[in-house]
Interface confidence: low
């Protein structure tokens, strides 16, 4: 594989990194973008023709400790008629989110960072069809 | 902050919310099998309200490349493959936290971030406003 | 201090080979995609190879392709340049340099922050 070509120019090396102990990093859990909101359409989980339910999962040993999780409703998807449409499927959309863990080994404590798969909402597909020889 | 259940056992002096600055291990611990969304499915191509994935990508961020949704119609694709404009295809946005460098380019100092990103799109009934 | 230093250098005759060793004592860079960098006697620095963090995804410039082969070993926190049938346009410093990307992926040539003092390649007959 080839690296494209961008010039000669590189990063200069901070002047002043903090000091980390070998195999760790330092992880500031202030949030940047604490307060922003997300705009979604209003009540696209109950509009949709894939609808969802939302739970919410609390963990205190996790950082954030409420992590938000989508169900869709149905198997199939809602037809123009209100009716659940068993010839296409309702999927769920998933993401990856970063948290940080917070383990108590004896009286000391250990902090991990662990990715975790959301899921968000639901989409209404075509199904595959697999025909059988 | 948020509180943590104490070991009753242990010293006071444990705080009980999460420290503003912590040292965490290099290894992340995924519990996900798939990691590129890109891959994981093709939901994207076929659903009734497909989307395009767009490559986001920042050094300064970990992860570094994020793939983000667009809608590619207003409306959705119908039983016949066409476009219906009387139903809306609309992005699902979910908060995600990332890391971000800093100060910048240390290799292994990071703050957390909260960004917005579109994960893919869903078909909805339009709300329909009537002028009286 | 972040530290990676090289060792491996020296004075070869054309046609010979090299084994350059970047050891990263602190393991600072065990998810950090690394470089082999080189910069000859009034030259700009160049890249010669780069490998991601885990190893599975090497890059190498046209130069140096199938004379050069860069590894990692993890356990040791070092990563390697095996350099053959060496020619004289080889002479240079070569520098070892960590790619800020904290994913480990190797992509372009422009985010190595972090460097080597670097070790002296001579090729000579």
């Known amino acids: 594989r080839k690296i494209p070509k961008v010039g000669h120019t590189f990063f200069q090396k901070p002047e002043s990194c903090p000091p980390v102990p070998g195999g760790s990093m330092k992880l500031d859990i202030g949030i940047i973008n604490e307060n922003q909101r997300v705009s979604m359409s209003r009540n696209i989980e109950s509009r949709s023709t894939s609808p969802w339910n939302y739970t919410v999962t609390w963990d205190p040993n996790r950082y954030p400790s409420e992590v938000v999780q989508a169900q869709c409703r149905n198997l199939g998807c809602i037809n123009a008629q209100g009716k659940e449409d068993i010839s296409m499927n309702s999927v769920p959309i998933q993401q990856e989110t970063l948290v940080v863990r917070r383990k108590h080994q004896g009286c000391s404590v250990s902090f991990q960072l662990e990715k975790v798969l959301v899921t968000v909402g639901c989409t209404c597909v075509t199904p595959v069809i697999h025909h059988v020889q | 902050g948020i509180t943590i259940p104490r070991n009753p056992g242990c010293p006071n002096s444990e705080d009980k919310n999460f420290p503003r600055t912590v040292m965490v291990n290099l290894n992340i611990h995924n519990r996900n099998t798939n990691t590129n969304p890109k891959r994981s499915s093709d939901y994207y191509n076929r659903s009734t309200s497909p989307w395009n994935l767009h490559r986001n990508e920042d050094p300064e961020r970990y992860p570094s490349v994020i793939w983000e949704a667009k809608c590619r119609h207003l409306g959705c694709i119908n039983a016949d493959g066409n476009v219906d404009y009387h139903m809306n295809s609309v992005p699902i946005q979910q908060e995600i936290l990332v890391l971000r460098r800093e100060p910048p380019h240390c290799p292994n100092s990071f703050r957390l971030e909260k960004i917005l990103v579109s994960v893919g799109c869903t078909c909805v009934t339009p709300i329909v406003h009537h002028v009286a | 201090e972040v530290q990676l230093v090289e060792s491996g250098g020296g004075v070869v005759q054309p046609g010979g080979s090299l084994r350059l060793s970047c050891a990263d004592s602190?393991?600072?860079?065990?998810?950090?995609?690394m470089g082999w960098f080189r910069q000859a006697p009034g030259k700009e620095r160049e890249f010669v190879a780069a490998?991601?963090?885990?190893?599975?995804?090497?890059y190498y410039a046209d130069s140096v392709k199938g004379r050069f082969a860069i590894s990692r070993d993890t356990a040791r926190n070092t990563v390697y340049l095996q350099m053959n049938s060496l020619k004289p346009e080889d002479t240079a410093v070569y520098y070892c340099?960590?790619?800020?990307?904290?994913?480990?992926?190797?992509?372009?040539?422009?985010?190595?922050?972090?460097w080597g003092q670097g070790t002296q390649v001579t090729v000579s007959s």
């Open positions: 340099g960590a790619r800020v990307n904290f994913d480990g992926t190797v992509s372009y040539t422009n985010d190595y922050a972090y």
């Open positions: 602190e393991r600072s860079f065990s998810f950090n995609a």
């Open positions: 490998i991601s963090a885990t190893g599975d995804d090497t």
